[in-house]
């Protein structure tokens, strides 16, 4: 029986060009975490395996960094990064737990101020 629950950062926002940490935490179970997969919609971003360590998908290597912990850091954010992210915890003996995070990437306040307060 699966008793665990995934806690996530929920809905988060970040500025374009900035970075954000995607974090999930599995609680209320003694199951062994064997692997965590990170997905963005239908794309595999990264995998953290208990034996093999981290694998970052080559197409995301420039902008995705492993950690902290089992989390994932997204860098140099663009508006195209807006969307759903999933942490998929593979555990033994429970099975699979999935957490969801929604990220909204906003135009930076610097850019907004630059547009509003132009020097004549």
């Amino acid at each position: 029986m699966m008793t665990g629950t995934i806690e996530t950062t929920g809905n988060i926002s970040a500025e374009k060009g900035g970075s954000i940490i995607l974090q999930c935490h599995l609680s209320s179970t003694t199951a062994q975490v064997t692997q965590v997969n990170w997905e963005q919609q239908d794309q595999l971003l990264a995998i953290c395996n208990a034996d093999l360590g981290w694998h970052i998908s080559p197409s995301f290597k420039d902008r995705v960094a492993p950690g902290p912990g089992l989390g994932l850091t997204l860098q140099s954010l663009t508006v195209n990064d807006t969307g759903e992210y999933f942490c998929i915890y593979h555990t033994y003996p429970d099975g699979t737990y999935t957490g969801r995070i929604f990220l909204e990437v906003l135009e930076s306040s610097v850019a907004e101020h630059g547009a509003r307060f132009q020097i004549p």
């Epitope: 062994q32 064997t34 692997q35 997905e39 239908d42 794309q43 595999l44 995998i47 395996n49 208990a50 034996d51 093999l52 694998h55 998908s57 197409s59 593979h90 033994y92 003996p93």
Partner: antibody, heavy 118, light 107 residues
Framework: EVQLLESGGGLVQPGGSLRLSCAAS????????MSWVRQAPGKGLEWVAS????????YYADSVKGRFTISRDNSKNTLYLQMNSLRAEDTAVYYC???????????WGQGTLVTVSS | DIQMTQSPSSLSASVGDRVTITCRAS??????LNWYQQKPGKAPKLLIY???SLQSGVPSRFSGSGSGTDFTLTISSLQPEDFATYYC?????????FGGGTKVEIK
């Protein structure tokens, strides 16, 4: 250099048994999930079974469930496939494959032929 | 079980041609899709993993794309050594399943 070497294939009568081995070298065997995949003569690839690294959890195709057992001996860097109650339709080349992150199969052995016939 | 349907089952092409092979899953498999090349009497060889990642040592003329249910393997300029059979495989869930294969023959 990663190497996988299967052995144990041969001719066996229907209802008989066979144990295949896959000797691994060139990598930390205990860290990787491993799989068996077979290919009947002139046919496509069919997954047979997989075994996880840390937990030893095993998974099977419906066609072999209850008859085949996948196992591993990390101290000997060897993967096994115990095949019982063999049928003519089990005739195939059997490959072992390394399965990093249980997502892809990056190295394959050369295969061993199992023929089930009377 | 997830069914993988490959098309075409065979094709004839010339050296230098651009070749496209498609693979469709019976349900969404995210990007858990791999492509293998197999030559007669040899073991399969991994070309593309996780839908679009090129395996180390594989020539860049091979590329993969797609997500969800529809995937494509493209060979940008077919070389003599590329005449072989190609298989897709899903690793989204067990049982792991392969497509029926696409045989690329010389025209």
């Amino acid at each position: 250099e990663v190497q996988l070497l299967e052995s144990g294939g041969g001719l066996v009568q229907p209802g008989g048994s066979l144990r295949l081995s896959c000797a691994a070298s060139g990598f930390t065997f205990s860290s990787y999930a491993m799989s068996w995949v077979r290919q009947a003569p002139g046919k496509g690839l069919e997954w047979v079974a997989s075994i996880k690294s840390s937990t030893g959890t095993s998974y099977y195709a419906d066609s072999v469930k209850g008859r085949f057992t996948i196992s591993r001996d990390n101290s000997k860097n060897t993967l096994y496939l115990q095949m019982n109650s063999l049928r003519a339709e089990d005739t195939a080349v059997y490959y072992c494959a390394r399965e990093p992150y249980s997502v892809w199969m990056d190295y394959w052995g050369q295969g061993t032929l199992v023929t089930v016939s009377s | 079980d997830i069914q993988m349907t490959q098309s075409p089952s065979s094709l004839s092409a010339s050296v230098g041609d651009r070749v496209t092979i498609t693979c469709r899953a019976s349900q969404s498999i995210s990007s858990y899709l791999n492509w293998y090349q197999q030559k007669p009497g040899k073991a399969p060889k991994l070309l593309i993993y996780a839908a679009s990642s090129l395996q180390s040592g594989v020539p860049s003329r091979f590329s993969g794309s797609g997500s969800g249910t529809d995937f494509t393997l493209t060979i940008s300029s077919l070389q003599p050594e590329d005449f072989a059979t190609y298989y897709c495989q899903q690793s989204y869930s067990t049982p792991l399943t392969f497509g029926g294969g696409t045989k690329v023959e010389i025209k």
